[in-house]
Amino acid sequence: AGHLEQPQISSTKTLSKTARLECVVSGITISATSVYWYRERPGEVIQFLVSISYDGTVRKESGIPSGKFEVDRIPETSTSTLTIHNVEKQDIATYYCALWEV
């Protein structure tokens, strides 16, 4: 079974800069999985942000504009990355990755 690790416990960024979060997949080939990213803002329910499927297809939360969250997958390091562009106060949250095994 696949296992996920998010090596960064926290990330502090200046407003308008870029934050890059990592999710390391082990126990399964990342190319045979779909990786999902969620966020939990303080006092709010967890929210789906974006996913990247085994074939590279990206789906995003329809209410968030393109260009805000960028998801990628690096097979060589078995890592999925979530890049948050133009960091602002509403991005303060806990971010989670999740795995769907195909």
């Epitope: 590279g56 297809t57 789906r59 329809s62 393109s66 805000k68 998801v71």
Partner: antibody, heavy 118, light 108 residues
Amino acid sequence: EVQLVQSGGDLVKSGGSLRLSCAASGFTFSSYSMYWVRQAPGKGLEWVSSIGSSSTYIFYADSVKGRFTISRDNAMTSLYLQMNRLGAEDSAVYYCARDGELGPFEYWGQGTLVTVSS
Amino acid sequence: EIVLTQSPGTLSLSPGERATLSCRASQSVSTSYLAWFQQKPGQAPRLLIFGTSSRATGIPDRFSGSGSGTDFTLTISRLEPEDFAVYHCLQYGRSPLTFGGGTKVDIK
């Protein structure tokens, strides 16, 4: 059927203001991000602004920042672009657009022409 | 800002021929975030390809996309009369979203 119907384009003097509207139907407007894209005569496409479903996220191209304001009314299922301090470089056909389920800008309005005269 | 440069500016071909359009980025673009649009005179653009190579709904299979990093290509395998138009590439991974300048495919 997704429909985006635009209005508000006009001839305006340099330094003037204009408000564009985009009336949406055929989908749950309050669930989707919306965009404005423009095209100057004989030129390429230029992204102008984006707004999230609940107006949480708003982005502008540097060329319009501080002059243009994007907004939406989810109850009226409408998108707006308030354009102030217009200059000749803002003359273009303005399109509103919505993403598809997978791809960007899958649905477009018919376009509305803004002409700025000196 | 990612600058997209399309070439050639104009491509003159005959129906039935193969068209190859290029889109070059000033910095690396994820393959998940590169799209192509077709635009005919007086009309709004139409999404053809997203995620570098996935065809949008209703797009015929003579249209295909490929590439990675900074170099992307749209190929029309056999030009039909209705394919003569302007084609735009777009990167939508990071704000500001940026379009290329367009390539016009016209009849030789």
